[in-house]
Amino acid sequence: RAVPGGSSPAWTQCQQLSQKLCTLAWSAHPLVGHMDLREEGDEETTNDVPHIQCGDGCDPQGLRDNSQFCLQRIHQGLIFYEKLLGSDIFTGEPSLLPDSPVGQLHASLLGLSQLLQPEGHHWETQQIPSLSPSQPWQRLLLRFKILRSLQAFVAVAARVFAHGAATLSP
């Protein structure tokens, strides 16, 4: 687990959970609405989504030097998406089916974020999405865009944890 002293996370656990997240993100993507995406939605919520970038220390060298920078960035992204999936974009109309993968996806995001940051250790959460209510007609497109960007995010995170599990595990 990543603790204030900067010790390594449970790379193998993180790898397994991030792979599950990838699967869930892909299975959730086509199942977010009742109709075709005919109306353009507001870009505001999806413009500011977190991306893992070159300077975040998620490359092999950066992970070797100090994995905490990358892990903090991944943690921030997980919290951001977890809050989006709990917002009315996903909990409002058109209602998702009770067995929608979005529920599992949401829980897994929370699970991985807790694995990276156990109780009592608090990283700064820089990006918190705006939670002002979304209009119902915007939500299908917003869901589509959020899940698409989440797919990209968890794909990179999964690669990071796969590398960590293979080369950085004790």
Partner: antibody, heavy 114, light 107 residues
Framework: EVQLQQSGPELVKPGASVKMSCKAS????????MHWVKQKPGQGLEWIGY????????NYNENFKGKATLTSDKSSSTASMELSSLTSEDSAVYYC???????WGQGTLVTVSA | DIVMTQSPATLSVTPGDRVSLSCRAS??????LYWYQQKSHESPRLLIK???QSISGIPSRFSGSGSGSDFTLSINSVEPEDVGVYYC?????????FGGGTKLEIK
Amino acid sequence: EVQLQQSGPELVKPGASVKMSCKASGYTFTRYVMHWVKQKPGQGLEWIGYINPYNDVPNYNENFKGKATLTSDKSSSTASMELSSLTSEDSAVYYCAVWDFTYWGQGTLVTVSA
Amino acid sequence: DIVMTQSPATLSVTPGDRVSLSCRASQRISDYLYWYQQKSHESPRLLIKYASQSISGIPSRFSGSGSGSDFTLSINSVEPEDVGVYYCQNGHSFPYTFGGGTKLEIK
């Protein structure tokens, strides 16, 4: 089976406040917003707003801002609505509804009378 | 706010009749429209969502059509138990608004 069980009727004096509840069962409470709808005797339906039980963020109809306060309690899977500064105009049946308005509570009758 | 207008206000029909209830929105709402039935002293019951999607447990004689701003609820063979008030609702944008209702009576 999804069920919404609302609290019992209320007889309240003008100027007072009242708080009613809607206990949800049969589904994951935090996965869907909970709506509240007003119906005056012999009249139509009016949407008050909803609460998102996951993050406790409400969304109000402008006509009910300052009148209704929506809250939720995850531990008991219960949504609540408090109405303040009651007048005779607030005498109505109040419903909670969830999941694309598919499931409705039985309603709570509020009577405002001196 | 989007204004929902229903017509007629009252409809008196004979069992077995096919009836159509109309709902018009003051602006286009795509197919974000709900239909409800409310019997006396009961909670509203959802009949149709998203203009034409049927609801589990609702008799197949109820159907919905329309898109944009004009919508219709059809009952293809009215039964005596269909008496009540029928409401349409804008589900497109906030605040959600309801029509004034159509009261269905049996002759």
